[in-house]
């Protein structure tokens, strides 16, 4: 080994990664909100829709105060990976009725992927445990009907909206602890 030499700074550090994750999450939340509103306009929902394969909401307002960095990031990454795969599935399985929303769903998927990469980079830089995301039990095959894919879309976008909402709050809280 040669004499000690300094390394130039790389593009970001963990705190900048966290800032970036907050911005990406906020932006994704706005996209999801907008897309969910479009869905409601085009295909009015008759009550709440659910998919058994979607992750259950990780946090409630009451638990925000006790959040720990590793738990939040791990859970957020696993849940977002599940939503990413559900959006992928939705784009593949969607009938003609949902094809009109394909550009928006494609953009949503790309943004989700960016956020997932940023979260993983943050976890790597902090050296936090990185559990391998389980493959979600995505419904097998295409939905039974066109209405089935519309109901699935309502459920996916609704769940993602709630997840991103707590994610923004959780990440902002974590910023104060890093």
């Amino acid at each position: 080994p040669g004499p000690p030499a300094g390394s130039p700074r790389v593009s970001s550090d963990p705190r900048a990664d966290l800032d970036s994750a907050v911005l990406l999450t906020r932006s994704l939340l706005a996209d999801t909100r907008q897309l969910a509103a479009q869905m409601r306009d085009k295909f009015p929902a008759d009550g709440d829709h659910n998919l058994d394969s979607l992750p259950t909401l990780a946090m409630s307002a009451g638990t925000l105060g006790s959040l720990q960095l590793p738990g939040v990031l791990t859970r957020l990454r696993v849940d977002l990976m599940s939503y990413f795969r559900h959006v992928q599935w939705l784009r593949r399985a969607a009938g003609p009725s949902l094809k009109t929303l394909e550009p928006e769903l494609g953009a949503l998927q790309a943004r989700l992927e960016r956020l997932l990469r940023r979260l993983q980079l943050l976890m790597s830089r902090l050296a936090l445990p990185q559990a391998a995301p389980d493959q979600p039990a995505v419904p097998l095959g295409p939905p039974a009907s066109a209405w089935g894919s519309i109901r699935a879309a309502h459920a996916i976008l609704g769940g993602l909206h709630l997840t991103l909402d707590w994610a923004v709050r959780g990440l902002l809280l974590l910023k104060t602890r890093l």
Epitope: G6, V10, P14, P70, Q120, R125, A127, L128
Partner: antibody, heavy 114, light 112 residues
Amino acid sequence: EVQLLESGGGLVQPGGSLRLSCAASGFTFSSYGMHWVRQAPGKGLEWVAVISYDGSYKYYADSVKGRFTISRDNSKNTLYLQMNSLRAEDTAVYYCAAGVPDYWGQGTLVTVSS
Amino acid sequence: QSVLTQPPSASGTPGQRVTISCSGSSSNIGSDYDVHWYQQLPGTAPKLLIYSNEERPSGVPDRFSGSKSGTSASLAISGLRSEDEADYYCSAWDSSLSGPVFGGGTKLTVLG
């Protein structure tokens, strides 16, 4: 400019102990997970151990588990590696590295030989 | 034997484009973990070249690019130069080891 400066390497007999230190400067040490990575002469890189930014998580390669202990002192911007029950196959240059790792020190040579 | 598999050597002439592959498994690259690439010039410490599959740290020329697909990744170097002669390592987190794993390294030789 980021600097990681390892020290504590040297010649030690099999079964002996050594403590490596790594002094960090030029970045927020307490915000980064820290690694030890080693490279045997003429060989590739082998990850040894990692400690999370706050010291709450520590992981080790199977080859050093139970013999090596990684620790850090964020108030001193310093990373440590306590190496016990050293074997000939532990002979290598030991690098201290931060983050992904994003930054690497220049390394310190540990020779285990009788 | 390394957890990630790289070809032991690669070569090219100045100006050429060379690609170095890195093959993993379902517990590392295939498990949606990002791949990072390092360059180690003779007698020096490794240096981060590509992170998060395709991102370049500041100061790394855009001749270097990375990509990832499934359980493998690759590093491409275009407009090869003599100073690119070095060892190149890929790395990714491995869930079964709870730590990063490295490829065995690829020695790049610039001919002529």
